[in-house]
């Protein structure tokens, strides 16, 4: 009797448990910015407050006939998915609805902004428990809508947005493209991307994760006991808003960064068939389907990391790409990736007091991505050590020289543009533990961190034969913090982290002319946090 | 995530013909005008004027009033629909696109974004 979507996102051990905040009351409040809703529906009656907020454009067309049940359809269904008694994810959660979409499901950026401001005002007038804002809407990229989301997120509000139903890059839409928003794509009962007519779920680096969004049974505004199924990234976002509400209900002090990291860490991995997405988006799109995580008390203080991709740098000679972590996260490593392989490497630098990951395009390159590894490391003290490029033929070594600091990542940046005159940099874990080693023309950057009980080790895997990629995974209990590709191929595309897997990519042409002696090596730095232990480097 | 991807940004640093008023003539527009890349989703005639982050409450109102005054001198009526105080400093205005150059030259203005549609997903 449990609908497929609830079975998918709520593991069996959670099905009957009820989430309550420590004092016994569920204080989380969800704000829904959508159409009007039918508050008298049995799914939501008594737990929905229909605010007097209404900021919508006129409906199109002279013959448009306003029918209450149609006007309320989208919002009522979503309210039911979030907190419906029977088909809701967070059954005990109270919900406030703001009308920003008209009877045709259209709204404006300005109306949405005024709605977000209304929430901020409510928060100032009457501070309450944790707030979750559900934005099941999308428009074209809007700098101001993204900025408003950023401002609201920085007040402690958790925003969850639909990725969009345009079968397109979510970064081209707002609020989906706002980094401070948890952006949700849609999957079906087979965990595959949702197709909606000729379109479907959005994808790309701006999507944080996917959730059920096809044939979702929920409250229908047709009648007070009616149910219906609807599909879309709105439904997917409503599932995640419900999960977040449940997480906050159990642990009201969880921050946005912690919530996002936990959602990512405990999601179901690698079930989505990535072939549905355009080829250039496959590496950027997370293969994650949301599930309700266990509480932090059950899982202890494990090190949580996520991968953040930059926007594409563009093809100009000096084009750079920048990837940033959220304010609470530590940037533990930085790598780069270029489809043509023409890149000049990556480095970490401080901009406005925040460490950022940068990557540089090379002459003739089609552009690069910077790939940041962003982690939650309680009480961390991290710094970057770099050494300029050595003279020809000499190695450059960088290690963490401060006491109790461990190496979490290495970056390499080549001064020369001619790719043929340089050799790839290397991590030498056996001879020189805890060091980044570069070769001629490479500046080397070591990311060094001190945190209670943080320990790290290097794990390498090399392949001599032809292969498009080399991977190395951190074992259970360890978390991937750094990922690099080491010498071997004449041309590597770069390296990036996918969950706990370090992927080193090799250019097709490089595969053909490689001798068996030249192994391409993926080098991972794996760390774990053992609060009782001292910071250490594991041989 | 928040790079300005498929997005139109137009610099409208028009030469100042501000009736010779000193403070107006001195201020060259560094602000930008932005609008949705999808033409069908645009709402020309409604604009969100976004002010610099440190702009004080009173300055927001003054900027909106100043725009109304200067528009009136040119024979345009503009309507301030909403003033934003709590999330960001700015205001929502209904006006002719002819006035964008003028609006971009106002003190404290960081950028102006044309309103656009959002849709249920």
């Amino acid at each position: 009797s449990i609908p497929w979507n609830l079975e998918r996102i709520i593991p069996a051990w959670h099905q009957t448990e009820e989430d309550r905040s420590p004092d016994g009351s569920s204080q989380v409040e969800v704000y829904l910015l959508d159409t009007s809703i039918q508050g008298a529906h049995r799914e939501i009656e008594g737990r929905v407050t229909i605010t007097d907020f209404n900021s919508v454009p006129e409906e199109d067309g002279t013959r448009f006939h306003r029918q209450a049940s149609k006007c309320d359809s989208h919002g009522t269904h979503l309210a039911g998915v979030v907190s419906g008694r029977d088909a809701g994810v967070a059954k005990g959660t109270s919900l406030h609805s703001l009308r920003v979409l008209n009877c045709q499901g259209k709204g404006t950026v300005s109306g949405t902004l005024i709605g977000l401001e209304f929430i901020r005002k409510s928060q100032l007038i009457q501070p309450s428990g944790p707030l979750v804002v559900l934005l099941p809407l999308a428009g074209g990229y809007s700098r101001i809508l993204n900025a408003a989301c950023r401002h609201l997120a920085r007040t402690g509000v958790v925003l969850v947005a639909a990725a969009g139903n345009f079968r397109d890059d979510a970064c081209l839409y707002s609020p989906a493209s706002a980094p401070e928003v948890i952006t949700v794509g849609a999957t079906n009962a087979q965990d595959q991307p949702v197709t909606l007519g000729t379109l479907g779920t959005n994808f790309g680096r701006c999507v944080d994760l996917f959730a059920p969004g096809k044939d979702i049974i929920g409250a229908s505004s047709d009648c007070s006991t009616c149910f219906m199924s609807q599909s879309g990234t709105s439904q997917a976002a409503a599932h995640v808003a419900g999960i977040v509400a449940r997480m906050l209900s159990r642990e009201p002090t969880l921050t946005l960064a912690e919530l996002r990291q936990r959602l990512i860490h405990f999601s179901t991995k690698d079930v989505i068939n990535m072939a549905w997405f355009p080829e250039d988006q496959q590496v950027l799109t997370p293969n994650l389907v949301a599930t309700l995580p266990p509480s932090t008390h059950e899982t202890g203080g494990q090190l949580l990391c996520r991968t953040v991709w930059s926007a594409h740098s563009g093809p100009t000679r000096t084009a750079t790409a920048t990837a940033r972590c959220a304010p609470e996260e530590e940037l533990l490593s930085c790598s780069s990736f270029s489809r043509s392989g023409r890149r000049r490497g990556d480095w970490i630098e401080a901009i406005g007091g925040q460490q950022v990951c940068k990557a540089l395009n090379a002459f003739g390159g089609e552009g690069v991505y910077a790939v940041a590894r962003c982690c939650l490391v309680p009480r961390a003290n991290c710094s970057i050590h770099n050494t300029p490029a050595a003279r020809a033929g000499l190695e450059t070594h960088v290690h963490c020289h401060q006491k109790d600091h461990v190496l979490t990542g290495c970056s390499f940046h080549w001064e020369v543009e001619d790719l043929s005159v340089r050799r790839q940099p290397a991590l030498r874990s056996r001879r020189q533990p805890g060091q980044c080693v570069g070769h001629q023309a490479a500046s080397v950057y070591a990311s060094c961190c001190h945190a209670p009980g943080l320990e790290c080790k290097i794990k390498e895997h090399g392949i001599s034969g032809p292969s498009e990629q080399v991977t190395v995974a951190c074992e259970a209990g360890w978390t991937l913090t750094g990922c690099n590709v080491l010498p071997g191929a004449s041309l590597t595309l770069g390296a990036y982290s996918v969950d706990n897997l370090c992927v080193a990519r090799v250019h097709d042409t490089a595969r053909a002319d490689r001798t068996s002696g030249e192994a391409t090596v993926a080098a991972a730095i794996c760390c774990r946090s053992r609060p009782s232990a001292k910071a250490s480097w594991v041989q | 995530q928040d790079e300005d991807g498929d997005y139109e940004e137009l610099m409208l640093a028009l030469p100042s013909q501000e009736d010779g008023l000193a403070d107006e003539a001195a201020h060259v527009a560094t602000a930008t005008f932005r609008r949705c890349s999808k033409e069908a989703w645009r709402l020309p005639g409604t604009y969100i004027v976004v002010l610099m982050e440190e702009t004080q409450r009173l300055q927001i109102e003054q900027t909106a009033h100043r725009l109304q005054t200067r528009a009136a001198r040119r024979g345009y009526v503009i309507k301030v629909l909403h003033i934003f105080y709590d999330l960001f400093p700015g205001f929502l205005v209904k006006m002719s696109s002819d006035l964008l150059g003028l609006a971009l030259k106002l003190p404290h203005v960081e950028y102006i974004e044309e309103d656009s549609f959002v849709f249920a997903q």
Epitope: E18, R47, D86, A87, C223, S224, T225, F227 | -
Partner: antibody, heavy 119, light 113 residues
Amino acid sequence: QVQLVQSGAEVKKPGESLKISCKGSGYSFTNYWISWVRQMPGKGLEWMGIIYPGDSYTNYSPSFQGQVTISADKSISTAYLQWSSLKASDTAMYYCARDYWYKPLFDIWGQGTLVTVSS
Amino acid sequence: DIVMTQSPDSLAVSLGERATINCRSSQSVLYSSNNKNYLAWYQQKPGQPPKLLIYWASTRESGVPDRFSGSGSGTDFTLTISSLQAEDVAVYYCQQYSSFPITFGQGTKVEIK
């Protein structure tokens, strides 16, 4: 198996109070609604009201609003129907029924509790 | 409230013959969002609680013999017993569950002629 077990028959005097019970087993009690249905001697079925044990939300038929109180104790998977002051006209068989949410109808019924009010 | 009216009040049919019961609602119980009629049929035998036979106006509950069928849409519905058996002697009720208060028809008593 899934079942609803109701408390035994009651004989009461007018003006007395009464609370009858309905205990659910074999399923997640908090996640299904419970309705109460009255059947007076030789008559048809009348829906009295409904409760969602998860949050004790209730909805009453206008005919029974203020006449009875529906409640639930989810810790012991039990729903209740109570009267503060019985009348002779309350003499009837009372059924509880589980409401299956997606097709909101009564898929499981209790065996019934006969309430007789007589001076 | 939606008023449910059944006809006839009682019905005597020979064993093996067809029995037809009608039910009319005072307003439509068909909803466009899922194209379903929120109407159910119950059977109540003497001394027993009612038993669900049909829901969504025409979907048989599992375990119900296929001689029972439901039809109709909007406001007019029919329960048909294609070949009456001795164990089918009971009172049959239609019920709308599209809105609170949930309402039943007054019942139709089916007997053997």
